[in-house]
């Protein structure tokens, strides 16, 4: 992984593109920290395991987060 101690935030670019929840392998939400002052959202896609940085401010991404949390609450007993 191209990481050095000087890298602060994970995302070089962020995407506004809608993501189909069915194509998601994993969704990581990284809270602000001493290294990176803002939230970062990283989607891991089922196809090839591609990882994509998403824009937390985008309406499409906010809808995705809602859909994913809804799905999780359905699954939990």
């Amino acid at each position: 992984i191209p990481l050095s101690r000087t890298v602060r935030c994970t995302c070089i670019s962020i995407s506004n593109q809608p993501v189909n929840p069915r194509s998601l392998e994993k969704l990581e939400i990284i809270p602000p920290s001493q290294f990176c002052p803002h939230v970062e959202i990283i989607a891991t896609m089922k196809k090839k395991g591609e990882k994509r940085c998403l824009n937390p401010e985008s309406k499409a991404i906010k809808n995705l987060l809602k859909a994913v949390s809804k799905e999780r609450s359905k699954r939990s007993p």
């Epitope: 990481l3 050095s4 890298v7 935030c9 962020i14 803002h38 090839k48 591609e50 990882k51 994509r52």
Partner: antibody
Framework: QMQLVESGGGVVQPGRSLRLSCTAS????????MHWVRQAPGKGLEWVAV????????FYVDSVKGRFTISRDNSKNTLYLEMNSLRAEDTAIYYC?????????????????WGQGTTVTVSS | EIVLTQSPGTLSLSPGERATLSCRAS???????LAWYQQKPGQAPRLLIY???SRATGIPDRFSGSGSGTDFTLTISRLEPEDFAVYYC??????????FGPGTKVDIK
Amino acid sequence: QMQLVESGGGVVQPGRSLRLSCTASGFTFSNNGMHWVRQAPGKGLEWVAVIWFDGMNKFYVDSVKGRFTISRDNSKNTLYLEMNSLRAEDTAIYYCAREGDGSGIYYYYGMDVWGQGTTVTVSS
Amino acid sequence: EIVLTQSPGTLSLSPGERATLSCRASQSVSSSYLAWYQQKPGQAPRLLIYGASSRATGIPDRFSGSGSGTDFTLTISRLEPEDFAVYYCQQYGSSPIFTFGPGTKVDIK
């Protein structure tokens, strides 16, 4: 359509300074990391510098560290390269390029939009 | 620092032929971090492939990328007249830095 336009190139004496600009249109500039890449006459491509979408990280090729500074003004959709202590070997076409949507340290989507370049000649 | 080597330096082929371009890294590179670009004389480079094998938007399917570890390949299945150009591989490495290979020129036989 997505477009990048560089400006600020010219002929400059060794040891002097120059500031390049790159103006973006057709996409949300503040969402994308940006690069400067150069190409010396008759040579291949050489990556120069990158700045994250939010300006939180900046990195440089060793040969320009301490002399060049990459910066951006998201309110003006503009990327800059401040070049100080210029040397003959900095003579090149300088391209700005957009980092692909969603790129991060775990997956790289490539430089997907390029400007046409601005020429910098360092000569006495 | 990872060094990329491209071979051959020049590839002389005729339209309709298959072109196979090689990119070798001095150390193992994750396929997630390898890209290919095309550059025609007097023009800016154009992204062809990212993630070693995914075609960029608008790139015809005659272009394909493959490989892993230290050996990567760009294949043009049937050369069209507009494909004669210089091709560069590029990797995103630690520090982080973005290194280009020296390029392979595909010219008309």
